[in-house]
C-alpha cells in the first residue's frame, strides 16, 4: 500500500522521500524565507480501507508574509492554549486542549493569517462528555457575571461573578457546573 | 510531561528472541508516536523503527527490516519491542522514545531496558 | 539513510567557555535537525529542535544554528553539568544519528 505524490506547495518545498512512498512515511512542508507557513506542516500516508494509500490532511499554504498582521486572543469555550502566546502574528500558531470532561472538535491547532484571522480551519470546539447541563445563572442586583458562553452551561465550565464599585461581594466569587448538572453554590449578593 | 517506563533488563541466548514494554503515562497516546532506539556499549544512537498507535502503523530501519516487529496496546498505552535472531552484537541499551504527534524529534525517553546477549 | 556526521569526536573546553559542535548531513534537510545531551547511565535529553528552538526548560545558553546540510550547536558558557556526550538527529527522511561529540573538562 502507497501514498501517491503528496501535494505541492507554492514558495515552499517538501521534504525528501523515496517512492513507492509506504503507508507511515511522513512528509514535511516549509516555506521560502520571506513567506509563512499556514497550516500543520507534516503529512502522514495513511490507510483507510487497506487497499489504497491517501494522506491524512491538506496541505499547508505558503502566505507572503504581512509585518503588519496580528490576530485576535482565540477562545475554545471548555478549552485552554497549551502552545502559543500573544502578541499573535502572521505565522504564529495556538494550539488547544480540551478542559477534564471535554472532548474535542475540529483541529487542535490554527495560524495567525496574513488576513488576521485564524485558520486555515475554523477554531477547534469542546464538547461536554456528559449530556448534563447547568441552568442559566441569574444576574445579580448592583453585579454582574461572566460566563464562557451564554445560556445553559456544560459541566467544568464557571461563572464569575463581580460587584460595582461602592458594593461588597457576599458569597462565593466563582461557581462551578457539576457534572450532576448542578452548580457548585448559589449565586452571591453584592451588598453595599 | 509524558512518561515512558520500560520493563527490566534481560539476558538471552544467541538465535532467541526479547520483547520490551514501553507503558506511556500522561498525554494521549493515540496522540503520539514511538520510536525504538538502541545504544550499543560506548556506541552511538540507532534508530530501528517506530509505531502510530492510533494507526497501528510501523515502520523500520533496512537493517532490522524482518527482524524487528513493534506494536502498541491502545488499551494499556504500552508500545512492545521484539528483536529476533539475536546475536552478540544485539547487546545494547533499547530505548523507547516519544515524538508529539509526527514532529520527529523526542520529547521523552524511557529510561532503556540492557538486552545482553551470550552463549 | 541519510548519514550524519559530528565533529570533533572529543571536545576538551574548560568551564565557563564557549563550546561550538558541529553535524554535517549527507544530503539537505532543511531545518529538520535536533540535538540531544547524554549524560552516563542516562537517557538522551531533548535541547534543540528544528535546528534553532530551544526545548522546553533548555537553558539560553543553550542555541543551534543552521539549515541545509551544515548545523552547529553552540553553548555559551560551559557550566559543570553541561559536561556530556551530544548527538544531532535528522528527521528529514525518516530518522537517523550523528556518532556523537563528547565535550568533556579541559
Known amino acids: 500500500i502507497s501514498c501517491g505524490s503528496p501535494p505541492p506547495i507554492l514558495n515552499g518545498r517538501i521534504s525528501y522521500y523515496s517512492t513507492p512512498i509506504a503507508v507511515g512515511t511522513v512528509i514535511r512542508y516549509s516555506c521560502s524565507g520571506t513567506f509563512r507557513l499556514i497550516g500543520e506542516k507534516s503529512l502522514l500516508c495513511i490507510t483507510k480501507d487497506k487497499v489504497d494509500g491517501t494522506w491524512d490532511k491538506p496541505a499547508p499554504k505558503c502566505e507572503y508574509f504581512n509585518k503588519y498582521s496580528s490576530c485576535p486572543e482565540p477562545i475554545v469555550p471548555g478549552g485552554y492554549k497549551i502552545r502559543g502566546s500573544t502578541p499573535y502574528r502572521h505565522g504564529d500558531s495556538v494550539t488547544f486542549a480540551c478542559k477534564t470532561n471535554f472532548s474535542m472538535n475540529g483541529n487542535k491547532s490554527v495560524w495567525c493569517q496574513a488576513n488576521n484571522m485564524w485558520g486555515p480551519t475554523r477554531l477547534p470546539t469542546c464538547v461536554s462528555v456528559f449530556p448534563l447541563e447547568c441552568p442559566a445563572l441569574p444576574m445579580i442586583h448592583n453585579g454582574h457575571h461572566t460566563s464562557e458562553n451564554v445560556g445553559s452551561i456544560a459541566p467544568g465550565l464557571s461563572v464569575t461573578y463581580s460587584c460595582e464599585s461602592g458594593y461588597l461581594l457576599v458569597g462565593e466569587k466563582i461557581i462551578n457546573c457539576l457534572s450532576s448538572g448542578k452548580w457548585s453554590a448559589v449565586p452571591p449578593t453584592c451588598e453595599e | 510531561q509524558v512518561q515512558l517506563v520500560q520493563s527490566g533488563a534481560e539476558v538471552k541466548k544467541p538465535g532467541s528472541s526479547v520483547k520490551v514494554s514501553c507503558k506511556a503515562s500522561?498525554?494521549?497516546?493515540?496522540?503520539?508516536?514511538i520510536s525504538w532506539v538502541r545504544q550499543a556499549p560506548g556506541q552511538g544512537l540507532e534508530w530501528m523503527g517506530r509505531?502510530?498507535?492510533?494507526?497501528?502503523?510501523?515502520n523500520y530501519a533496512q537493517k532490522f527490516q524482518g527482524r524487528v516487529t513493534i506494536t502498541a496496546d491502545k488499551s494499556t498505552s504500552t508500545a512492545y519491542m521484539e528483536l529476533s535472531s539475536l546475536r552478540s552484537e544485539d547487546t545494547a541499551v533499547y530505548y523507547c522514545?516519544?515524538?508529539?504527534?509526527?514532529?520527529?524529534?523526542?520529547?521523552?525517553w524511557g529510561q532503556g531496558t540492557l538486552v545482553t546477549v551470550s552463549s | 539513510e541519510i548519514v550524519m556526521t559530528q565533529s570533533p569526536a572529543t571536545l576538551s573546553v574548560s568551564p565557563g567557555e564557549r563550546a561550538t559542535l558541529s553535524c554535517r548531513a549527507g544530503?539537505?534537510?532543511?531545518?529538520?535537525l535536533a540535538w540531544y545531551q547524554q549524560k552516563p547511565g542516562q537517557a538522551p535529553r531533548l535541547l534543540i529542535y528544528?535546528?534553532?528552538t530551544r526545548a522546553t526548560g533548555i537553558p539560553a545558553r543553550f542555541s543551534g544554528s543552521g539549515s541545509g546540510t551544515e548545523f552547529t550547536l553552540t553553548i555559551s558558557s560551559l557550566q559543570s553539568e553541561d559536561f556530556a556526550v551530544y548527538y544531532c538527529?535528522?528527521?528529514?527522511?525518516?530518522?537517523?544519528f550523528g556518532q556523537g561529540t563528547k565535550l568533556e573538562i579541559k
Open positions: 538527529q535528522q528527521y528529514e527522511y525518516w530518522y537517523s
Open positions: 522514545a516519544r515524538e508529539e504527534d509526527i514532529s520527529g524529534y523526542y520529547q521523552d
Open positions: 509505531i502510530i498507535p492510533i494507526l497501528g502503523i510501523a
Open positions: 500522561g498525554g494521549t497516546f493515540s496522540s503520539y508516536a
Open positions: 528544528d535546528a534553532s
Open positions: 544530503q539537505s534537510i532543511s531545518h529538520y
